[in-house]
């Protein structure tokens, strides 16, 4: 954690007044995920990089504010600074993944989360009270709410799975957390299978 | 034990600025919300917004979005709220407060009196 | 917005009796698992304190003397007996949807 907002800082730091400008207008436009809301235009035009960094950061998380600044960096034709930020990502990701992978286990990779996928899309029943326990700490207000909105608590799941490739190892831990707190034995289940 | 402590009164002029704190302590400041809520004198209550300290992620109720802003700094496990262009009409008491799982307000400080007179 | 609307605005009770606040939202604010309304307790001078959260369930420390009841768009807090020490102003408060709102209060008198 941090490491991204810094990267996201020097990047717009970088840009001269005209660029951050256009970049401003660029981000009044660009393709969001579903689930995330858009910074209103008043408050965003009045920015300076470390206010807009913060405000970015705060309305995306660093994950994929990151990848947000990525791509309207690279639809600038800014491709050096992109791939700055994209080295940066890359290594964040390393680190999350090493962090990640049990000492005595190589047969086994990545995360909990990532390897129970759709044994916990299946069994998770109490989907609300997990939101509640990621709300604002992992998931923003949309998409906790996009995220209740669906009827059945599979929809829930695989809505909530939709958000997790943007996650680092702390989200995914945050919700392992949760899981444990609401389901112990499914997660006790789950991890002896 | 959970404590949430505010700065003290303030008395401040028309147009102006204000900042006041809000400093946590007996649990992990990172993990919560905390939220603030503006009371006039013999009135309701009226939500601000929140901000979660881990990440900086804020939200504002629309009717406060051009008046208030919210920061925290993790190193000394304190959140800030600042409220900007100021009119009799910011004169109330603001009370920060903890959200607890299902965003109730479990821990509430013992509140800010602003008052903005000429 | 959603609106919580409290009734009665005042009421009195006698020591012993019980005391009956209703909290109406303008919406449904229950999903299949919980209901995002809360209760507080103010008196003067003093910041609100939570009594119940999530629609029934008591915070530690508050008396069992305090229930809250409800799902959808209609909660209820009944306090009985009531004590001497109960006279204040009593707050509802969702967090359904962003802005979370406040019921307008209900003073509570004593007999």
């Known amino acids: 954690m941090g490491r991204a907002r810094d990267a996201i800082l020097d990047a717009l730091e970088n840009l001269s007044g005209d660029e951050l400008k256009k970049f401003k207008m660029k981000l009044l436009t660009v393709q969001l995920r579903e689930g995330y809301g858009r910074i209103p235009r008043g408050a965003l035009l009045q920015m300076d990089a470390i206010d807009l960094t913060d405000k970015l950061v705060s309305y995306y998380l660093e994950s994929y504010g990151l990848e947000l600044t990525m791509t309207v960096l690279r639809d600038m034709g800014l491709q050096e600074l992109a791939e700055q930020l994209q080295t940066t990502k890359e290594e964040s990701g390393a680190v999350a993944a090493a962090a990640s992978v049990p000492a005595q286990s190589t047969a086994r990779t990545g995360h909990f989360v990532d390897q129970h996928r759709q044994a916990l899309i299946a069994r998770v029943t109490e989907v609300d009270g997990v939101l509640d326990a990621l709300h604002g700490s992992v998931l923003t207000e949309g998409q906790y709410q996009a995220v209740r909105a669906e009827t059945t608590s599979q929809d829930k799941m695989r809505k909530l799975f939709s958000f997790v490739p943007s996650w680092n190892l702390t989200c995914k831990d945050s919700l392992l957390q949760a899981l444990k707190e609401i389901h112990p034995y499914l997660v006790m289940d789950l991890e002896q299978s | 034990e959970v404590q949430l402590q505010q700065s003290g009164a303030e008395l401040v002029r028309p147009g102006s600025s204000v900042k006041m704190s809000c400093r946590t302590s007996?649990?992990?400041?990172?993990?919560?919300?905390i939220t603030w809520v503006k009371q006039r004198p013999g009135q309701g209550l009226e939500w601000i917004g929140y901000?979660?300290?881990?990440?900086?992620?804020?939200e504002y109720n629309e009717k406060f979005k051009d008046k208030a802003t919210l920061t925290s700094d993790t190193a000394s496990s304190t959140v800030y709220m600042q409220l900007n262009s100021l009119t009799s009409e910011d004169s109330a008491i603001y009370f920060c407060a903890r959200l607890d799982r299902g965003r109730a307000l479990d821990y509430w400080a013992q509140g800010t009196t602003l008052t903005v007179s000429s | 917005d959603i609106v919580l609307t409290q009734s009665p605005a005042s009421l009195a009770v006698s020591l012993g009796q019980r005391a009956t606040i209703s909290c109406r939202a303008s919406k449904s604010v229950s999903s299949s698992a919980y209901s995002y309304m809360h209760w507080y307790q103010q008196k003067p001078g003093q910041p609100p304190k939570l009594l119940i959260h999530?629609?029934?369930n008591l915070e530690s420390g508050v008396p069992a003397r305090f229930s809250g009841s409800g799902s959808g768009t209609d909660f209820t807090l009944n306090i009985h007996p009531v004590e001497e020490e109960d006279a204040a102003t009593y707050y509802c408060?969702?967090?359904?949807?962003?802005?979370?709102?406040f019921g307008g209060g209900t003073k509570l008198e004593i007999k």
């Open positions: 999530l629609a029934s």
């Open positions: 901000i979660y300290v881990g990440n900086g992620y804020t």
């Open positions: 408060q969702h967090s359904w949807e962003l802005p979370y709102t």
């Open positions: 007996g649990y992990t400041f990172t993990n919560n919300g």
